[in-house]
């Protein structure tokens, strides 16, 4: 099942997902002066079985100026996903974060894909989110949103994260992003009865902090 | 085939300099942080620095400030890391990485963690003797 909208943006702060689950598909989308081949992908779908995840289709881009539909060929994400365990021969990385079953890692980059990558994502994705550079977090709970199915609608949960100044003084220190989990972490889906939501609290704290929401703008 | 090679390595003297490349092909840097970890003998692969392509903000570490510099010329798709006033302690090899950008195309440095790379590079020695 597809989340209905995107994850919540939190001022001065940014978010990506560590692993992405299995159904989520990423626009094929390219930088200005650029378009998707003619019979190109339109998307790139995440795919697998219980052993083993890949992205499936692949994103080619040309320029917009030419009417050569010459293939600018880049290889299967498998194929790059292979070549960048034999090519790195030094122990840099610990456990992929996405070999969690049934995610798939960051797709490999295509020639003269768009800056920003647009998403789909499915029930159950978890994002992270960080203060950008310059700012430091307050926390109140987990800096993540997971998307979660709730008597049929979809929606993300609130991400207990503000971003602050890092002139600003603050009682809560940073903290490190935490190592994928697959899933959210355990919450009450059983009743809809609406008390003082995480969006509220979040809202309350961040009126006094910040007014301004970053809204995306995909182009 | 996104590919990143790395050259400029080498030995040099305490209180030297040596200017490292490292060149990408395969992709643009627009949508990605670039930059550099190390690795010295037996030691934990450390982030030193990293440059995001698309507004090109700095990250660098507290034990290299002041004198290493990291700039790129997207044009060529090459990220350099200029590094003066080299000290026994930044010996070790130098590895060119690469991590997607954020929402908004914005980066956090504590996601430039060895373990959350997307690709890398095979590495330049770096030796500074005493």
């Known amino acids: 099942e597809l989340c209905d909208d995107d994850p919540p943006e939190i001022p001065h702060a940014t978010f990506k997902a560590m692993a992405y689950k299995e159904g989520t598909m990423l626009n094929c989308e390219c930088k200005r002066g650029f378009r998707r081949i003619k019979s190109g992908s339109l998307y790139m779908l995440c795919t697998g079985n219980s052993s083993h995840s890949s992205w499936d289709n692949q994103c080619q881009c040309t320029s917009s100026a030419t009417r050569n539909t010459t293939k600018q060929v880049t290889p299967q994400p498998e194929e790059q996903k292979e070549r960048k365990t034999t090519e790195m021969q030094s122990p840099m990385q610990p456990v992929d974060q996405a070999s969690l079953p049934g995610h798939c890692r960051e797709p490999p980059p295509w020639e003269n894909e768009a800056t920003e990558r647009i998403y789909h994502f499915v029930v159950g994705q978890m994002v992270y989110y960080q203060c950008v550079q310059g700012y430091r977090a307050l926390h109140r709970g987990p800096a993540e949103s997971v998307c979660k199915m709730t008597h049929g609608k979809t929606r993300w949960t609130q991400p207990q994260l503000i971003c602050t100044g890092e002139m600003e003084t603050s009682q809560f220190p940073g903290e490190e992003k935490p190592q994928a989990s697959p899933e959210g972490r355990p919450e009450s889906e059983t009743s809809c009865l609406v008390t003082t939501t995480d969006f509220q609290i979040q809202t309350e704290m961040a009126a006094t902090m910040e007014t301004s929401i970053f809204t995306t703008e995909y182009q | 085939e996104v590919q990143l090679v790395e050259s400029g390595g080498g030995l040099v003297q305490a209180g030297g300099s040596l200017r490292l490349s490292c060149a990408a092909s395969?992709?643009?840097?627009?949508?990605?942080?670039v930059g550099w970890f190390r690795q010295a003998p037996g030691k934990e692969p450390e982030g030193v620095s990293y440059i995001t392509g698309s507004d090109g903000v700095t990250y660098y570490i507290d034990s290299v400030k002041g004198r290493f510099t990291i700039s790129s010329d997207n044009a060529k798709r090459t990220v350099y890391l200029q590094m003066n006033t080299l000290k026994p302690e930044d010996t070790a090899v130098y590895y060119c990485?690469?991590?997607?950008?954020?929402?908004?195309?914005?980066?956090?440095?504590?996601?430039?963690?060895?373990?959350?790379?997307?690709?890398w590079g095979k590495g330049t020695l770096v030796t500074v003797s005493s």
């Open positions: 395969g992709f643009t840097f627009d949508g990605y942080a």
């Open positions: 990485a690469v991590d997607r950008l954020g929402s908004q195309g914005r980066y956090a440095s504590s996601w430039w963690r060895a373990g959350d790379m997307d690709f």
